[in-house]
Structures are given as C-alpha cells and as structure tokens.
C-alpha cells in the first residue's frame, strides 16, 4: 500500500472576524495507526489547536465523523475567529508510540488570514480653541483591522483635504493593525458650522467606509467686533449709547461699561442673536444723563470673550454740545442710567 500522504488543499484562506474558519485536511491511507493533530505554526513553539486523541478544544469541531474508521477527512472548523487566530495551520499525522506519539507526516500548511473591521474612527482636535487664519491639527485613529491595507481620507465640509500625514502600525506582520493620521486645517470666520471628517476604507467594509467627525465649533473662537454709537436724544438730558458686539463665537462673553475709566456696570451676555454662519451678536446700551456732567465723558465698552484678554471700544460724549441750562431742571440722581434689550 502507498505511504500515507497528508493533503491540505488550501494554501491560504481568508475569514472575517467573528465567522468560522474551515481548515481542510485529508489523508490517503488508514495506516499507520495513530492520531491526527492540528497545530498553528511549526517547530518547537507550535501551538496545539486540536488533538484527535485527547483534550478539550471548545472552539474546534471536526467536519467529518471521526468515529468512522474509513474516514480520511480530518478537516476542522474553528468558530468565532479573531485576528489573534491568524497564522499557518498544519495537519499532522502521528504514529502511535511511547513515551510520545511519533510525528509521521505533516501537511503543507494552510495560512489563515483574518479580515477584521477597523474600529469607528475617532477624530480629536486641539485642546485649546484657535482663531481664524490659524492652522490647527486634527488626529484620526482607528484600530484592530486586518489585513494591513487601508485608505484614509480627510474632508472639510465635503472638500477633500491634502495636508495630512498617516501611519499604519506596526510596520511588520501583526494579527491586527492601527492607523493614525494628522491633518492640518486653516480656520476661517465661517467655520462655526464646519465639520472635519476622517473617512476610512477597508476591504472588510464592502465599500461602505467608516467616518469620524469633529465639529469645528469645538475648535474655533471667532473674536467679536465692537461698535459704540450714540443714538439720538431719547429724552431731555438723556443720551442713549449702544455697544454692538458682533460676529463672535462661542457665546461666553462679559461686557463692562467704563465712564472715564471707572467701571460703571458689568453684565454677562444672555439673550443673543444667532447669525446664519453660527456666530452671535449682542447689544448693550447706556442711558447717559448729560446734565450731571460738566465735562466731556469718555464711555468705554470693554468685552472679555471666552476668557481671552479684553477688547474695548470708546466713545466721547461731548457735554459742551448741550445747553448749560439743560441740567437746571434735572433732579439730582445718577449720572448714568443703563438698559439692555430683554
């Protein structure tokens, strides 16, 4: 009778993580008597996957009924494959012996590669906010995929970005891989509603890439523009001075009025108007009783936005422009009165 051969017909197979892998093996003879064993890897460090003779292998089932003597099919099925199962599997025929069974013949091996989906990309931006015209960096990370080939793209509002660097680790063979990419984005005043998207395409995703997003509203700070104006006289001896705070983001804003350098009133922005671009406007005003002043008054609107150093705008209120007698009928009281829109 011809000497037994161990046939592993598949040089390689590829299986998606979570699925089962079937490793095929047939022998050409019933002799010599002895068990079949499956190993991952070769040499002294090889890992026993299945032993026909003994042991508990909860993830392994035999494809054929090994209790039938004329069975020559020793294929196995490994359930719930993970990237850690990747490797070359050998079907090995042993001859019964002591003190150990003797390896008689090995199959050529079947390389199992595991297709594992990348994790959802996580995009993170800078720790601190930045203002328009500045360049900020965004990072994108995805892990646990296999094989190593992967494509990563960056978009800002649907437009593909080109200024980015990507690394896939590790460089050598591994059960699974990670990707890390850093993109540079120039901020504009219109970016409050903008999104940066990291898109990852991999063979396991069947043409439906994974996306991670970052809203630039978390990253951008648009400083306000200030305008202080004197409104027409509202009542005899009273002047309405307004401070328009325009186009700022985020909302956090505190406004202080100063009269000739002295703090008159501090208020926190509350009822804001939102612009189409996502920035906000706010207005504060003062009612100034000019009859209480002999000299010109310098009114300053000072704004502290999002914890940044204050910016201010001043307005000179000319007292001399009013008739001297206008203060004669005014009851004594505060020199400044204020109001803000509800």
């Amino acid at each position: 009778e011809e000497e037994l051969q161990v046939i592993q017909p598949d040089k390689s197979i590829s299986v998606a993580a979570g699925e089962s892998a079937t490793l095929h093996c047939t022998v050409t003879s019933l002799i010599p008597v002895g068990p079949i064993q499956w190993f991952r890897g070769a040499g002294p460090g090889r890992e026993l996957i299945y032993n026909q003779k003994e042991g508990h292998f909860p993830r392994v089932t035999t494809v054929s009924d090994l209790t039938k003597r004329n069975n020559m099919d020793f294929s196995i099925r490994i359930s719930n494959i993970t990237p850690a199962d990747a490797g070359t599997y050998y079907c090995v025929k042993f001859r019964k012996g002591s003190p150990d069974d003797v390896e008689f013949k090995s199959g050529a091996g079947t390389e199992l590669s595991v297709r594992a989906k990348p994790s959802a990309p996580v995009v993170s931006g800078p720790a601190a906010r930045a203002t328009p015209q500045h360049t900020v960096s965004f990072t994108c990370e995805s892990h646990g995929f296999s094989p190593r080939d992967i494509t990563l793209k960056w978009f800002k509002n649907g437009n593909e970005l080109s200024d980015f660097q990507t690394n896939v680790d590790p460089a050598g063979d591994s059960v699974s891989y990670s990707i890390h990419s850093t993109a540079k984005v120039v901020l504009t005043r219109e970016d409050v509603h903008s999104q940066v998207i990291c898109e990852v395409a991999h063979v396991t995703l069947q043409g439906d890439p994974l996306r991670g997003t970052a809203n630039l509203s978390e990253t951008i700070r648009v400083p306000p523009t200030l305008e202080v104006t004197q409104q027409p006289v509202r009542a005899e001896n009273q002047v309405n001075v307004t401070c328009q705070v325009r186009k700022f983001y985020p909302q956090r804003l505190q406004l202080t009025w100063l009269e000739n350098g002295n703090v008159s009133r501090t208020e926190t922005a509350s009822t804001l108007t939102e612009n189409k671009d996502g920035t906000y406007n706010w207005m504060s005003w003062l009612l100034v009783n000019v009859s209480a002043h002999r000299d010109d008054v310098k009114l300053t609107c000072q704004v502290e936005h999002d914890g940044q150093p204050a910016v201010s705008k001043s307005h000179d209120l000319k007292v001399s422009a009013h008739p001297k007698e206008q203060g004669s009928n005014t009851a004594p009281g505060p020199a400044l009165a204020s109001a803000a829109p509800l």
Epitope: L30, P35, K53, K68, R69, P99
Partner: antibody
Framework: EVQLVESGGGLVQPGGSLRLSCAAS????????MHWVRQATGKGLEWVSA???????YYTGSVKGRFTISRENAKNSLYLQMNSLRAGDTAVYYC????????????WGQGTMVTVSS | DIQMTQSPSSLSASVGDRVTITCRAS??????LAWFQQKPGKAPKSLIY???SLHSGVPSKFSGSGSGTDFTLTISSLQPEDFATYYC?????????FGQGTKLEIK
Amino acid sequence: EVQLVESGGGLVQPGGSLRLSCAASGFTLSSYDMHWVRQATGKGLEWVSAIGTAGDTYYTGSVKGRFTISRENAKNSLYLQMNSLRAGDTAVYYCVRGGVWDDAFDIWGQGTMVTVSS
Amino acid sequence: DIQMTQSPSSLSASVGDRVTITCRASQDINNYLAWFQQKPGKAPKSLIYTASSLHSGVPSKFSGSGSGTDFTLTISSLQPEDFATYYCQQYVSYPYTFGQGTKLEIK
C-alpha cells in the same frame, strides 16, 4: 447494528487443526484492525493475533508459526487457522474489533470455545 | 513484552462505595491503556480507551486517569451490576498485553 459472531470452535486432539470464523455485520471489516483474544477457563485475557487494514499480521510468541490470521473481504469475515494445537490453547476465543484511530478494542464477539484434549 | 500489573487482585466493597483499581506498566505506554469489564460467562465489555476516554454508552461513574506507567480506574458509586472482573490492557505496541484482572466482589 455492529456485531461480531464467532464460530468454528469445538473439541480437537492435540496436534490437530481448527479454523475459527468471525462474521462481521454493521461495518466493513477490512477498514479496521481486527484481533483474536483468548481466555482459558478461570484465567485472564490473552491477546493472540491481529491483522491490520493493509493485511499486515501480528502474533503472540506462543502461537507464532502455528496460527494464521486472515480475512475475506467479500464475506466480511475474519479467520484464525489454528494448527499443531496444544492443551495450552484450550480457551474461549473472542473476535475483537480495533478502534477507529488508535486500535483500542471496542466491539467484542460472544466467543467460541476451543478444547484441545485427547 | 510489556508487563501489566493490576492491584489489588481482588476487592470487596459495598453498594454506594467509591473504588479505585490501579494498573502499572513495565515501561512507558504513553496513554494507550484500556479498561474492560467482564462478568462470568460473558464477553468482556470495553469501558475506557486512551486512559481516560469513555466508550460510547459507558456511564460517567466510570473514570480513568494516568499516563506513562501508572493508571487508575475509579467507579464513583458502586451499583450491584458493577460487581465483575476488571482488566487493563496496553495497546501501544504488539504483543498487546493485559493485566491479570481485579475481581470486585460484594462485601
């Protein structure tokens, strides 16, 4: 049902011959290593002979040259030709099937009695 | 030839008892050891192969262990039908050899 049925035992004079048969049913005999085991009255079990799937044969020392194991695939039967019989060969002879991959005995026949006496 | 030695040769026990029979090989036999049960006038019945694997239909009260040269058969809770003679056998190499048997009797 997997079954082994022995026949051919009986009384024979020392120096005489006897041919034991074992008819297998429920499985293909040629796919298994097959054995003969004997047991003298009140004694333990003694392995006698085996035939492998490739036709290779094995014997215990005391029967070598006197006993011959064979099989007939068409009849799905195993045989033991016993020549030059001695009083020490008196025993119940069992036909036994070897296990699937390690030749562990799994199926036994009911036995046939061989008595060697003058 | 490989010699197989069983102990004890006979053993008295009661229903419900747990009993252990040992078998020693004269040389390493890996785990190619089988256990058989035989009742008077009957053919032996296969219980265990490769030292610890139960043949189909054998109740789990029977268990085997060991490797190399020392092996044991344990019956966890004796029932009346378990009183019989038990044999061990090595089948790693020809000639296959049996132990002399252990007769388990009712006390």
